[in-house]
């Protein structure tokens, strides 16, 4: 009831609280001389389902039949109108429409490590929109029954608070859930276990790692358990993979040698237990440990290339270029590379440990036979040395490749391709593809880049350290014992028309002919490999069209003659670049008038 | 250190109910498990009911469906509700504390709080 019905009562039959789709009787009457004041006659008693009207009658009593309620609470207020008065409320019900408790499913229970205490789960079923009270019963040895009781709405979990013992852990407990409201109620099935089915270990902890004599093939992994723990799982992985690597193991006593470890790798280590082979669950899985194994000597050899350099006619220069070991060669931090030079008939040796850098340039006599070794080292030992005899890698005219070319493939790649030598192609022992941006200096601080091809290969698809719109210079060497032939070609991945002309920077006049120089086109506006320079010229202030003259395009060039112009006229003169995109813009132009005679 | 006084307790007649009570001072009151036992002119101590941190309670066979134990962890309070009170009831009834809840609470040497006891009788 609401309010303090001074003025009447409401009735509710059979009660308040109803199962869905039952009817109910709602009475609302006034008490003794509570009507309106003078005409008890003129009483209009009013029923509201919340805020709406529902029915109404004259007199001191109103009957009620009510069907169709919703799931829920559902409010009812009865009033008294009166002649030129506001509704008077007389009394008020809440009608509560739920169902019975469906049986509560699938009863479990857990105790979480040997030290917790038991909880147990169900699920409810569909909610029956009244108050339901839920009673937990936990029956076992010595004739013992626990019960908890639990009020909240949505109740689908209780914790008894009790600590189960392995004194007898085959001894058998049932727990059973009853749910009840005012409507029915209903008990799960009895759930039955022991002890070991429902304990569940906590994790292992205190995770540590051991490396004996710091090396990766002796490694201990310690972990401290549950006292009763008898199984354990072990997962490992390195830092940066997705895929765990698992053992399981018995009556481990916390501890495992783990044997597959990679030198120099950080893992994550997780354990999780469980007390019995085939009762019970496992814990969760522990923190994880990082840790790094320690170091080993490295494995694997570098890949050592070179370049020779003419100085002058006692000298040349060496330079010495070899790619950084794998992480899986290395094993370990590489602290430097060792150098060793060696004269192979006079016996005279250099050795320089190189740190930061992965080449080595020194100049040497012309004469004399040379070889070098190169190593990696980390803190554990030095990788084997990779031997290289110095020689002139492009001597053997019969090894060179032929048909050499580069074309584009897809972005940022170049496929190379190439014919055998002439010589006996079965003497090819390896072949080399060697890149390098194309610098018209000839600079040998640009990178070098480099791959090994085996002997029946004819094509390489280069792509690393390729860039849109540059040139490369790329060799093939074809490499047999102490010889060695090599043929050239430009290449790019990609590449348009250049960004600009080359700039004429002088014009000089030589026995009736001129001799145009010009600046090279920077790199960065080059936009690839340049096929051709043109030169036009045509007569100042005429309409004319230009004459030119197409130059194939070498790297070290930059002057050129032209011989058709005649003297006393004044020409304009400016030039243009050409890639297999397209020509670029004009250069600068310049004026020039022949001083020599005419024929 | 936790103190434990019981209240309650005196003379009823057969069939009559009584409320027994028991004030623990000290703090964690809400983590222990407390107890009921009794014992009986020139008999041994035995279990009568018990109730975890939690809320479950159990009681003995003599007593199950008569009395009842709950308890108030706002006011550090251990109630016994008698019912039907037989002859066989009298006894000293006293209110136990252990910090563990184990499955069997009627071992009477994990507790390690005790009270002085209060006199139950029920005469004929």
């Known amino acids: 009831k609401i309010d303090a019905c001074k003025r009447g009562d409401v009735t509710v039959k059979p009660s308040h609280v109803i199962l869905l789709g039952s009817t109910v009787n709602i009475t609302c009457s006034l008490k003794p001389r509570q009507g309106c004041f003078h005409y008890s006659r003129r009483n209009k008693l009013i029923l509201y389902k919340f805020d709406r009207r529902i029915n109404f009658h004259h007199g001191h009593s109103l009957n009620s039949q009510v069907t169709g309620l919703p799931l829920g609470t559902t409010l009812f207020v009865c009033k008294l109108a009166c002649i030129n008065s506001d509704e008077i409320q007389i009394c008020g019900a809440e009608i509560f429409v739920g169902v019975a408790p469906e049986q509560p499913q699938n009863l479990s229970c857990i105790q979480k490590g040997e030290q917790g205490t038991v909880a147990c789960t169900w699920e409810r079923g569909r909610d029956t929109h009244l108050y339901t009270e839920y009673t937990l019963q936990l029956s076992g040895p010595k004739n013992l029954t626990w019960q908890k009781q639990c009020k909240d709405i949505y109740c689908d979990y209780l914790d008894f608070g009790i600590n189960l013992t392995p004194e007898s852990p085959e001894s058998n407990f049932t727990a059973k859930v009853t749910a009840v409201n005012s409507l029915g109620s209903s008990s799960s099935l009895p759930s039955t276990f022991t002890f070991l089915d429902i304990v569940r270990p906590l994790p292992p902890w205190d995770i540590r790692i051991k490396f004996q004599k710091a090396s990766v093939s002796r490694c201990t992994l310690y972990w401290r358990d549950e006292g009763l723990v008898l199984l354990n799982r072990l997962r490992y992985r390195p830092s940066n993979s997705r895929l765990w690597n698992m053992v399981n193991v018995t009556k481990a006593k916390g501890r495992h040698d783990l044997l597959d470890l990679k030198p120099f790798t950080e893992y994550e280590f997780q354990i999780s237990s469980k007390l019995h082979l085939y009762k019970g669950s496992w814990s969760d899985w522990s923190e994880s440990l990082r840790a790094q194994t320690p170091e080993e000597e490295p494995t694997g050899m570098l890949d050592v290339w070179y370049m020779k350099r003419h100085i002058d006619y006692s000298r040349q220069q060496i330079s010495l270029f070899w790619k950084n070991l794998s992480v899986s060669e290395a094993r370990g931090k590489i602290l430097h590379y060792q150098v060793t030079l060696q004269e192979l008939t006079g016996g005279k040796a250099m050795t320089q440990n190189i740190t930061g850098h992965t080449s080595w340039t020194t100049v040497i006599p012309r004469t004399g036979n040379w070889a070098v070794a190169v190593s990696a080292a980390n803190s554990k030992g030095s990788s084997l040395p990779t031997r290289i005899n110095i020689m002139n890698l492009c001597e053997a005219g019969l090894l060179a490749p032929r048909q050499v070319s580069a074309n584009s493939e897809g972005m940022d790649n170049i496929l190379v391709t190439w014919q055998p030598p002439r010589k006996d192609p079965s003497a090819v022992q390896e072949y080399v593809v060697e890149w390098r941006e194309l610098h018209p200096g000839g600079d040998t601080q640009v990178p070098l880049n480099w791959l090994r091809s085996r002997p029946y290969n004819v094509s390489a698809l280069i792509s690393e350290n390729i860039k849109s719109y540059i040139c490369y210079e790329i060799r093939v060497y074809a490499l047999s014992g102490d010889q060695g032939g090599c043929s050239s070609i430009l290449g790019n991945s990609k590449h348009k028309a250049p960004l600009s002309g080359p700039h004429i920077n002088a014009i000089t006049e030589e026995k009736g002919s001129i001799l145009i120089s010009w600046n090279s086109i920077p790199v960065q506006e080059q936009m690839g490999c340049l096929l051709h320079y043109r030169i036009y010229w045509k007569e100042r202030d005429s309409n004319s069209q230009p004459q030119l003259c197409e130059i194939p395009y070498r790297v070290s060039q930059n002057s050129h003659p032209i011989n058709s112009l005649q003297p006393r006229v004044t020409y304009v003169l400016w030039m243009t670049a050409l890639t297999a995109a397209g020509e670029s813009s004009h250069g600068n132009e310049r004026e020039f008038c022949l001083q020599g005679k005419a024929n | 250190q936790v103190q434990l006084v019981e209240s309650g307790g005196g003379l009823v007649q057969l069939g009559d109910s009584l409320r027994l009570s028991c004030a623990a001072s000290?703090?964690?009151?809400?983590?222990?498990?407390m107890a009921w036992f009794r014992q009986a002119l020139g008999k041994r101590r035995e279990f009568v009911a018990a109730?975890?941190?939690?809320?479950?309670?159990t009681c003995s066979a003599e007593s199950e469906g008569r009395f009842t134990i709950s308890r108030d962890n706002a006011k550090n309070m251990v109630f016994l509700q008698m019912n039907s009170l037989k002859a066989e009831d009298t006894a000293v009834y006293y209110c136990?504390?252990?910090?563990?809840?184990?499955?069997?609470?009627?071992?009477?040497?994990?507790?390690?709080?005790w009270g002085q006891g209060t006199q139950v009788t029920v005469s004929s």
């Open positions: 000290g703090r964690g009151f809400s983590s222990w498990t």
């Open positions: 109730i975890t941190a939690t809320g479950a309670r």
């Open positions: 136990a504390a252990t910090g563990i809840a184990s499955w069997d609470p009627g071992m009477a040497d994990k507790y390690t709080y």
